[in-house]
Amino acid sequence: DAEFRHDSGYEVHHQKLVFFAEDVGSNKGAIIGLMVGGVVIA
């Protein structure tokens, strides 16, 4: 059987990013996203 390992040789850093909702619409409050490897994914 083939064995698959996730071992890319480098660390993928993640960081929480916070945006204000009113910058992108009419809502108030904060939008919290997660940036992984330079891409905002959530």
């Epitope: 960081q15 929480k16 990013l17 916070v18 945006f19 204000f20 909702a21 009113e22 910058d23 992108v24 108030k28 409050g29 904060a30 996203g33």
Partner: nanobody, 124 residues
Framework: EVQLLESGGGLVQPGGSLRLSCAAS????????MGWFRQAPGKGREFVAA????????YYADSVKGRFTISRDNSKNAVYLQMNSLRPEDTAIYYC?????????????????WGQGTLVTVSS
């Protein structure tokens, strides 16, 4: 770009309060989300709080939530940080910053204008 000048720092006992002010010059003040960061001796600059362009929305670091309140007065081009229940670990230089709309408000790289900072020392 706006120019920023902080004031209101000083020496306060644990459990005490201080109100920091940040005066902004420039006609584009309400195009910017405004934030406070702090830098303790030997440490990096960390996010404290931010307020949206309108003043309606705010966001706080977990370490200050419930103790600090950020606000702004667009008619006076000013931002404020009311700090209550101060602790020794709040000792730092506090910086006011301006971040253009749509950028992440909790990270230093979003801020393109900074004041010179005001020192807050919490000690008995």
């Amino acid at each position: 770009e706006v120019q920023l000048l902080e004031s209101g720092g000083g020496l306060v006992q644990p459990g005490g309060s201080l109100r920091l002010s940040c005066a902004a010059s420039g006609r584009t003040f309400n195009n910017y989300n405004m934030g406070w960061f702090r830098q303790a001796p030997g440490k990096g600059r960390e996010f404290v709080a931010a307020v949206s362009r309108s003043g309606v929305s705010t966001y706080y670091a977990d370490s200050v939530k419930g103790r600090f309140t950020i606000s702004r007065d667009n008619s006076k081009n000013a931002v404020y940080l009311q700090m209550n229940s101060l602790r020794p670990e709040d000792t730092a230089i506090y910086y006011c910053g301006a971040a253009y709309r749509g950028t992440a408000i909790n990270v230093r790289r979003s801020y393109d204008s900074w004041g010179q900072g005001t020192l807050v020392t919490v000690s008995s």
